[in-house]
């Protein structure tokens, strides 16, 4: 049961992380808490990739619920062997984990690109522009240049904070799904052969 317990632990963590990803992505649509920029299409192109909503969010809920379900005691066996069914379930969880890896990977890549390019903002010339796109992410180290964006208010801070959160959350999701790949492979091969004393406490 130890592999199932660990999977359940990972599953619950992923649900929380997925919800945080969705929330962070939604906030990107409302710079400074305002709706006008979304309606005027004055948002960074990478906001429209739905990396936190789809990649780190909805796509992550599928493996999360699969992992949570692995600890159920009424797991059906195959050919009358209950353990065989549990092994199959553990191995199938590897597929779910790979979906999670794809989703979290997408979230991480888009967040990194969003950070590197910087926000779409009304620049010092009065033009809606990717003011920091040519800096190759160097603007992140030079906060004195952030005032080049005159609108939305605090847009650089907003974008940097939320894309960084998405990057971190996606990274954690990626690691957890990777752990579950290993856990699932071990659980599938070894079966539920570990003793009752070897249970994970999560």
């Amino acid at each position: 049961m130890c592999y199932g317990k660990c999977a359940r632990c990972i599953g619950h963590s992923l649900v929380g992380l997925a919800l945080l990803c969705i929330a962070a992505n939604i906030l990107l649509y409302f710079p400074n808490g305002e709706t006008k920029y979304a309606s005027e299409n004055h948002l960074s192109r990478f906001v429209w990739f739905f990396s936190g909503i789809v990649g780190g969010g909805l796509l992550m809920l599928l493996p999360a619920f699969v992992f949570i379900g692995l600890e159920q005691d009424d797991c059906c066996g195959c050919c009358g062997h209950e353990n065989c069914g549990k092994r199959c379930a553990m191995l199938s969880s590897v597929l779910a984990a790979l979906i999670g890896i794809a989703g979290s990977g997408y979230c991480v890549i888009v967040a990194a690109l969003g950070l590197a390019e910087g926000p779409l903002c009304l620049d010092s010339l009065g033009q809606w522009n990717y003011t920091f796109a040519s800096t190759e992410g160097q603007y992140l180290l030079d906060t004195s240049t952030w005032s080049e964006c005159t609108e939305p208010k605090h847009i650089v801070e907003w974008n940097v904070s939320l894309f960084s959160i998405l990057l971190a959350l996606g990274g954690i999701e990626f690691i957890l799904c990777l752990i579950q790949v290993i856990n699932g492979v071990l659980g599938g091969i070894c079966g539920f052969c570990c003793s009752h004393q070897q249970q994970y406490d999560c």
Epitope: L125, G126, Q127, T150, E151, P152
Partner: antibody, heavy 120, light 106 residues
Framework: EVQLVQSGAEVKKPGASVKVSCKAS????????VKWVRQAPGQGLEWMGW????????IYAADFKGRVTMTTDTSTSTAYMELRSLRSDDTAVYYC?????????????WGQGTLVTVSS | EIVLTQSPATLSLSPGERATLSCRAQ?????INWYQQKPGQAPRLLIY???NLASGIPARFSGSGSGRDFTLTISSLEPEDFAVYYC?????????FGGGTKVEIK
């Protein structure tokens, strides 16, 4: 009618400060920026900077940084430009101008101008 | 900063004649605006984005050009057109104006 009405002429001593006001009417104040341009007697036009009236974020020309402050009061649709440490070469007519954002950026509505004379 | 050089500094013409004003940029720019200023008055926008006529401006005014060379043309001068004309660039900060071309009655 769309218009910008500026405060009256000022006479200041070198080292003093001047604050020029610019009241907008006939349009939504926060939909446009306000730029400040000055013109010394018999000379051309010089851009001083501009302020985003929606966010209050100003952008100053390098020549005026540290000496100029641009602010707005959205409740009265008024923009302000304060110039400190005045010198005799700051004697000029100061214009506030409505600034259209976008791919084509232009100054379509000008205030009547405020003459600031710096003399000891 | 991008320096704009206007030529000629003074243009002496008669009403009804065609006026061609030049504005040359130190380096390539996207667009320019043209303004007209009469003595004791604030400048007035004539042309924006190189070739677009501002609201309320007569069709005898037209703008053209690209890169470094831009032109304002007044097809047939009216008495009220005698004034100083400025070009202005907005491709980079600081925004700069040309030195002006004075169109005077010959």
């Amino acid at each position: 009618e769309v218009q910008l009405v500026q405060s009256g002429a000022e006479v200041k001593k070198p080292g003093a400060s001047v604050k020029v006001s610019c009241k907008a009417s006939g349009y939504t104040f926060t939909n446009y920026g306000v730029k400040w341009v000055r013109q010394a007697p018999g000379q051309g036009l010089e851009w001083m900077g501009w302020i985003n009236t929606y966010t209050g974020n100003p952008i100053y020309a390098a020549d005026f940084k540290g000496r100029v402050t641009m602010t707005t009061d959205t409740s009265t649709s008024t923009a302000y430009m304060e110039l400190r440490s005045l010198r005799s070469d700051d004697t000029a007519v100061y214009y506030c101008v409505r600034f259209q954002y976008g791919d084509y950026r232009y100054f379509d509505v000008w205030g009547q101008g405020t003459l600031v004379t710096v003399s000891s | 900063e991008i320096v704009l050089t206007q030529s000629p500094a003074t243009l002496s013409l008669s009403p009804g004649e065609r006026a061609t004003l030049s504005c040359r940029a130190q380096s390539g720019i996207s667009f320019i605006n043209w303004y007209q200023q009469k003595p004791g008055q604030a400048p007035r926008l004539l042309i924006y984005g190189t070739a677009n006529l501002a609201s309320g401006i007569p069709a005898r005014f037209s703008g053209s050009g690209s890169g470094r060379d831009f032109t304002l043309t007044i097809s047939s001068l009216e008495p009220e057109d005698f004034a100083v004309y400025y070009c202005q660039q907005y491709s980079s900060n600081p925004l700069t104006f040309g030195g002006g071309t004075k169109v005077e009655i010959k």
